[in-house]
């Protein structure tokens, strides 16, 4: 008789999750010499230990501490790029501007990017059928708690001028409920972070509006200013040209507004 299994509203653990995490870890440590000391088997064991045999709606940041410790990584604190709802462009940017880092350019972010995982209470099984959805089931699920934990630490580590890429095509350019709006903004350290500079990425070719005047950007400005961090905002009217100019800053067309 098949054992009863909890049905959750979200997709199940990504296929070949253990193999994927291990392979990503090996690849990352080969590419990044400063992380060559990392033992990927230990990293997987710590990752697994955070959620296996635990109720997938009762995961805490504490569960991830062994993994956080193993994945400790120093990134230049003044080279951090945050993003919200525009991951692909942010990643394209850091692939070109190699001295800047998104969370997914760090070991822990790279390991988990685009993956889903959860376990079951009191069994050592990984649940490949379904995992809790943040809205419909519970917020303290393995994936959400992981991203909350690593995002908080990433924001806490930032200094000087921190950049954030925001999607100007969305109805809420700044969304208080996003990871950026609910976690990262509130964990920037005012004694270390001088300025948060928002880059609002335009979607339409002919969109010449100043999206820095959007009410949600004003809301972000207010939150940041209350924390005694300076705020700055730039419109990126042409993201394609923006990336091109990052690649070739000497190009004569790159002096005009992008």
């Amino acid at each position: 008789v098949p054992r009863w299994r909890q049905q959750w509203s979200g997709p199940g653990t990504t296929k070949r999750f253990p193999e994927t995490v291990l392979a990503r870890c090996v690849k990352y440590t080969e590419i990044h010499p400063e992380m060559r000391h990392v033992d990927c088997q230990s990293v997987w064991d710590a990752f697994k230990g955070a959620f296996i045999s635990k109720h997938p709606c009762n995961i805490t940041e504490e569960d991830y501490q062994p993994l956080m410790k193993l994945g400790t990584q120093t990134v230049p604190c003044n080279k951090i790029l945050l993003w919200s709802r525009i991951k692909d462009l942010a990643h394209q940017f850091t692939q070109v501007q190699r001295d800047m880092f998104t969370l997914e350019d760090t070991l822990l972010g790279y390991l988990a990017d685009d993956l889903t995982w959860c376990g079951e209470f009191n069994t050592s099984k990984i649940n490949y059928q379904s995992c809790p959805d943040w809205r419909k089931d519970c917020s303290n699920n393995p994936v959400s708690v992981f991203w909350k934990t690593v995002s908080r630490r990433f924001a806490e580590a930032a200094c000087d001028v921190v950049h954030v890429m925001l999607n100007g095509s969305r109805s809420k350019i700044f969304d208080k409920n996003s990871t950026f709006g609910s976690v990262e903004v509130h964990n920037l350290q005012p004694e270390k972070v001088q300025t948060l500079e928002a880059w609002v990425i335009h979607g339409g070719r002919e969109d010449s509006r100043d999206l820095c005047q959007d009410p949600t950007i004003k809301e972000l400005e207010s939150i940041i200013s209350k924390r005694n961090i300076q705020f700055s905002c730039k419109n990126i009217y042409r993201p394609d040209k923006f990336l091109q100019c990052v690649k070739n800053p000497e190009d004569s067309s790159c002096t005009s507004e992008i």
Epitope: T72, Q73, T74, V75, P76, C77, N78, R153, E156, A157, C159, D160, V161, Q189, E191, K192, Q194, T195, E197, S225, N228, I229, Q230, F231, S232
Partner: antibody
């Protein structure tokens, strides 16, 4: 290029007030906070505090709460330091210095002498 | 407040030799692997000039003869080789914790 240009030397009597200016050029003043640093004759450097040039909110180190006021006039890209009820021990060179927490850009300094 | 103690208070070095200044802090100035310790050079009648930021990063335009190292509570500024125009006062400064604080300074003279 980025420059911070301060007002000239001042000779003041005890009890008077002085206002030192720091004009920023080569960048947008409101993008970076402005710090003030004091150096008494033959002495080391003391951080007095900073002003958030975006919101205008000042932060003072404990030893500089009370008689010291940081202010701004963004229309002329200038930060100000005002000292009231001057005392002989306020005699020093006062520097403005641009953020971040390490100061890559400094004004040339303003010597304030308090003497009767 | 974090107290910064520099040593020595002064030193005399011959041109071509190495000068080493240390700065010890009363508590760690590290955060997530970054050390918030900075070094300045000040010549008479001039404002301080940033040499090294965050313990080991050479400020743009500063000669590679200057280098910084250290972490947590112990930091070093090295000038190697020393040149005649390196005569100046040198200060360390932390920005890990408000209020920012400076060391008392080290006077470097060239023999």
């Amino acid at each position: 290029q980025i420059q911070l240009v301060q007002s000239g030397s001042e000779l003041k009597k005890p009890g008077a007030s002085v206002k030192v200016s720091c004009k920023a050029s080569g960048y947008n003043l409101t993008n970076y906070g402005m710090n003030w640093v004091r150096q008494a004759p033959g002495q080391g450097l003391e951080w007095m505090g900073w002003i958030n040039t975006y919101t205008g909110e000042p932060t003072y180190a404990d030893d500089f709460k009370g008689r010291f006021v940081f202010s701004l006039d963004t229309s002329v890209s200038t930060a100000y330091l005002q000292i009231s009820s001057l005392k002989a021990e306020d005699t020093a060179v006062y520097y403005c210095a641009r953020y971040p927490g390490w100061f890559a850009y400094w004004g040339q300094g303003t010597l304030v002498t308090v003497s009767s | 407040d974090i107290v910064l103690t520099q040593s020595p208070a002064s030193l005399a070095v011959s041109p071509g030799q190495r000068a080493t200044i240390t700065c010890r802090t009363s508590e760690s100035v590290d955060s997530y692997g970054n050390s918030f310790m900075h070094w300045y050079q000040q010549k008479p009648g001039q404002p301080p000039k940033l040499l090294i930021y965050r313990a080991s990063n050479l400020e743009s335009g500063v000669p590679a003869r200057f280098s910084g190292s250290g972490s947590r509570t112990d930091f070093t500024l090295t000038i190697n080789p020393v040149e005649a125009n390196d005569t100046a006062n040198y200060y360390c400064q932390q920005s890990n914790e408000d209020p920012w604080t400076f060391g008392q300074g080290t006077k470097v003279e060239i023999k």
